[in-house]
């Protein structure tokens, strides 16, 4: 297993609709054809997997049908979008990149993006 540098923004504020997008960029040392991207969430020292996708270079990322993540890839960059977020989902989202094929296997883990989510203000009651 060889180490690889992964860069991601430090802080992102999700949209009012609970959608957060950020780029995860990895310094690929070779010509990988198969890449696996995993998003981990760290909150109070607990780490949970949010979503994961394996893709072939040049193809779209394919997450599971019920995943809250979508993404696109371009060269050594992966543009990740997480949707359906609420205030309670605020936390550190870490991008993990694995170059699966061809060998050697490379692993890179970013420092994390602190995603803040604000629940929309409830609409005031109206007579209509």
């Amino acid at each position: 297993c060889k180490a690889m540098h992964v860069a991601q923004p430090a802080v992102v504020l999700a949209s009012s609709r609970g959608i957060a997008s950020f780029v995860c960029e990895y310094a690929s040392p070779g010509k990988a054809t198969e890449v696996r991207v995993t998003v981990l969430r760290q909150a109070d020292s607990q780490v949970t997997e949010v979503c994961a996708a394996t893709y072939m270079m040049g193809n779209e990322l394919t997450f599971l049908d019920d995943s809250i993540c979508t993404g696109t890839s371009s060269g050594n960059q992966v543009n990740l979008t997480i949707q359906g977020l609420r205030a309670m989902d605020t936390g550190l989202y870490i991008c993990k990149v694995e170059l699966m094929y061809p060998p050697p296997y490379y692993l890179g883990i970013g420092n994390g993006t602190q995603i803040y989510v604000i629940d929309p203000e409830p609409c005031p009651d109206s007579d209509f």
């Epitope: 923004p9 430090a10 802080v11 992102v12 504020l13 009012s16 020292s45 605020t90 803040y116």
Partner: antibody, heavy 116, light 108 residues
């Protein structure tokens, strides 16, 4: 090294608007947020809101909602805070700070005096 | 919104003494997201502690932070003349971010 340099002191009349700038250098501007904090004479720190330089999304303190606008210009790595309908109790030093996510670097402050 | 309360309001001590400042949150957020700032007259605040217990770059080791849940403490082990200032706690675990009202450490 990381630096935030703010615009100079301003004197405004009640009802006017003020726009304070905050020029950032020494780091990747879009990777962080910029927050604005004010301090009235002899008072504590009051959080006004913040902007994510990555995507331009903002969150304002309820007290300032509708009266404040925070923006960034990524081409010049500058953040702006505009406060409208100024009142005498808006007289304060206005600070910008980097959200990293703690407020790890601060500008020197800009004194805004509201007086008729 | 998380409300922060600081005590005492003023702490009168002599150089060389130990200072213990308290910060209490109205609700338990993420304990990793509490910061302490120092502010001297006419100056911008300066980050001392982040993540409740991690010292910021260039901060002397006489400053230490501890606590979790709703109760946090800033300790200055031996007060130096330059430590007399106002100290604010702040939570950045959820937006809106909030500050405590501050504790003034002055010379006895």
């Amino acid at each position: 090294q990381v630096q935030l340099v703010q615009s100079g002191a301003e004197v405004k009349k009640p009802g006017a608007s003020v726009k304070v700038s905050c020029k950032a250098s020494g780091y990747t501007f879009t990777s962080y947020g910029i927050t604005w904090v004010r301090q009235a004479p002899g008072q504590g720190l009051e959080w006004m809101g913040w902007i994510s330089a990555y995507n331009g999304n903002t969150h304002y303190a309820q007290k300032f909602q509708g009266r404040v606008t925070m923006t960034t210009d990524t081409s010049t790595t500058t953040a702006y805070m505009e406060l409208r309908s100024l009142r005498s109790d808006d007289t304060a030093v206005y600070y910008c700070a980097r959200v990293g996510p703690s407020f790890d670097y601060w500008g020197q402050g800009a004194l805004v005096t509201v007086s008729s | 919104e998380i409300v922060l309360t600081q005590s005492p309001g003023t702490l009168s001590l002599s150089p060389g003494e130990r200072a213990t400042l308290s910060c209490r949150a109205s609700q338990s957020g993420s304990s990793s997201y509490l910061a302490w700032y120092q502010q001297k007259p006419g100056q911008a605040p300066r980050l001392l502690i982040y993540g409740a217990s991690s010292r910021a770059t260039g901060i002397p080791d006489r400053f230490s932070g501890s606590g979790s849940g709703t109760d946090f403490t800033l300790t200055i082990s031996r007060l130096e003349p330059e430590d007399f200032a106002v100290y604010y706690c702040q939570q950045y675990g959820s937006s809106p971010f909030t500050f405590g009202p501050g504790t003034k450490v002055d010379i006895k």
